[in-house]
Interface confidence: low
């Protein structure tokens, strides 16, 4: 049993042109979230199929709404870790699909919508209790960089998780052929339970249950001796109580490695020795060599030591991945400070300061008012990195330069109309109002609300508001 | 700071062993594989040895394999190749690597190397 652990990265338009456009929007905010679907093996098999090894969702990122006129960055991704329990053995070679689901915030009748934003897959081998394993993949215009890795759950170690771990029964070691459980060494390693009534000393297993036979017995619990009536056997007759054993095929007969390679045995298996140029189990995988210069943007090739890593690449600084393919994501740092945007131009970095900052890093905070005239007598704010201007009666807009209607506003009160006077403005209220506003009414006797009206004015004249 | 500094190179005569030292500073190597790559006059690098400390994995070029070992105390951060039945064709700059591993696919394991020391010189010779 174990946990196999997915870790996005980013998730972002691709390298190259057609930048994708953002899937969200000021009207339509949204959020990411990712689905995982294992299958064991190197499956062909549809992206329907049963997700046999496990599947997870994951949560759902923050809230997006993209910036007008900005390109459409990485979006913000989910917090954590999609994790797929296994319950049986990691099986080594696995498919994967990981989907990546946008959901939509609008207003939706029935709750959010979503929708498949990309979806990418993948055939690997991986061991569990390995490092973590980085990849990147593309869908479309989109770039998803990920991490993954299979952990074995206590007490299963080993590379398929298969092998056991228990509390030591002495303190000082382990019992006889049992090793330590690196990295836990208070802890042994539990005999495999092999399939019942297995002979210990004919038979041994490498996965619980099984029961398979040393050279010379045969039988389901390897009990058998392999013996003829006739002693042809190179090897020689044997004791007559085991007649003569004869070979079964040897594990190099027919000869197993591919592509010109030389097979030798070893106590349980084979070993192929590959020729140049090729790799594998078999020497069944052309790979690529040092000869073939893999290591892009001045990465240094070194020949893999492992019968199964072709080379290494020595990347320079800036760049990273298998094949120093991958330039370091500097701008992740957030080096741009006070909002500035961060562009990473390869031989540089450059940030996009916002209105009202500056510098390399847009560390200054500009004086927003410097050299900045409100027209008409109005006065400059400063605040939040942006200047406003506080504007005189009549005026406005950025830099007061406007006239501004005084009637835009409807101040004249029940009915009355306004009219546009240089110094202000004036209503001109309908029958039985007054007032500057003509928010008074006129008593039915004649007197009104107010004082007596100013001399030369009579009750439902033009009132001028100064 | 990734830091890597290597240490216990020497004049050894054929046939003699010596105990090389990586000692990592600025990361834990137990999130890594650490080798050893070695570079011989006149000849291109060549990656002697590998091991990842957080479950003992290693692997060895098939040059040292059965004289040189590779072992690791995450304890002191510290990754370490004791080369026995040392001969002349051993002679090269020892480097010190961070690996990092990216995986298994198209019939290989990927890695990188992206940090590495500035070297301990060995000598064999009689």
């Known amino acids: 049993a174990g946990v196999f652990e997915l870790q996005i990265h980013s998730f972002g338009p691709g390298p190259g042109p057609g930048a994708p456009r953002s899937p969200c929007s000021a009207r339509l905010p949204c959020r990411l979230f990712f689905r995982v679907c294992l299958k064991p093996g190197l499956s062909e098999e549809a992206a329907e199929s049963p997700c046999a090894l496990g599947a997870a969702l994951s949560a759902r990122g923050p809230v997006y709404t993209e910036q007008p006129g900005a390109p459409a960055p990485d979006l913000p991704l989910p917090d954590g870790l999609l994790q797929v329990p296994f319950r049986d053995a990691w099986p080594g070679t696995f498919s994967f699909i990981i989907e990546t689901w946008r959901e939509e915030l609008g207003d939706q009748i029935g709750g959010p919508a979503w929708s498949l934003l990309a979806r990418v897959a993948g055939r690997r081998r991986l061991a569990a209790g390995g490092p973590w394993a980085r990849d990147i993949q593309r869908a479309g215009a989109w770039e998803l960089r990920f991490s993954y890795r299979a952990r074995c759950e206590p007490p299963a170690v080993g590379t398929a998780c298969t092998r056991l771990c228990r509390p030591r029964s002495a303190p000082s070691r382990c019992g006889p052929g049992l090793r330590p459980c690196a990295p836990l060494e208070d802890e042994c390693e539990a005999p495999l339970v092999c399939r019942a009534g297995c002979s210990p000393e004919h038979g041994f297993c490498e996965q619980p249950g099984e029961c398979r036979c040393l050279e010379g017995w045969t039988g389901p619990l390897c009990t058998v001796p392999v013996s003829t009536s006739s002693c042809l056997s190179p090897r020689g007759p044997s004791s007559a109580t085991t007649g003569c054993l004869v070979p079964g095929p040897g594990p190099c007969d027919g000869n197993p490695c591919a592509n010109g390679g030389s097979c030798s045995e070893t106590p349980r298996s084979f070993e192929c020795t590959c020729p140049r140029g090729f790799y594998g189990l078999r020497c069944e995988v052309s790979g690529v060599t040092c000869a073939d210069g893999p290591c892009f943007n001045g990465g240094l090739c070194v020949g893999g030591a492992d019968p199964d890593s072709a080379y290494i690449c020595h990347c320079p600084p800036g760049f990273q991945g298998s094949n120093c393919e991958k330039r370091v994501d500097r701008c992740s740092l957030q080096p741009c400070r006070n909002g500035g945007l961060c562009l990473d131009l390869g031989h540089a970095l450059r940030c996009r300061c916002r209105a009202g900052f500056a510098g390399p890093r847009c560390e200054h905070d500009l004086d927003d008012c410097a050299g900045r005239a409100c027209a008409n007598g109005g006065t400059c704010v400063e605040g939040g990195g942006a200047h406003r201007c506080s504007c005189a009666l009549g005026f406005g807009g950025r830099d007061c330069r406007e006239r501004a209607d005084p009637c835009a506003a409807r101040p004249c009160a029940h009915g009355g109309r306004c009219y546009a006077h240089f110094s202000g403005l004036v209503c001109a209220c309908a029958p039985g109002y007054m007032g500057a506003r003509c928010e008074f009414p006129v008593h039915p006797d004649g007197a009104s609300a107010l004082p007596a009206a100013p001399p030369g004015l009579r009750p439902g004249d033009p009132q001028r508001y100064l | 700071e990734v830091q890597l500094v290597e240490s216990g190179g020497g004049l050894v005569q054929p046939g003699g062993s010596l105990r090389l030292s990586c000692a990592a500073s600025?990361?834990?190597?137990?999130?890594?594989?650490i080798g050893w790559v070695r570079r011989a006059p006149g000849k291109g690098e060549e990656l002697v040895a590998r091991i990842y400390p957080t479950n003992g994995y290693t692997r060895y070029a098939d040059s040292v394999k059965g004289r040189f070992t590779i072992s690791a105390d995450t304890s002191k951060n510290t990754a370490y190749l004791q080369m026995n039945s040392l001969r002349a064709e051993d002679t090269a700059v020892y480097y010190c690597?961070?690996?990092?591993?990216?995986?298994?696919?198209?019939?290989?394991?990927?890695?990188?190397?992206?940090?590495s020391g500035q070297g301990t010189l060995v000598t064999v010779s009689s």
């Open positions: 690597a961070r690996h990092h591993y990216y995986g298994y696919h198209s019939g290989y394991h990927h890695y990188a190397i992206d940090y």
């Open positions: 600025g990361f834990n190597i137990e999130h890594y594989s």
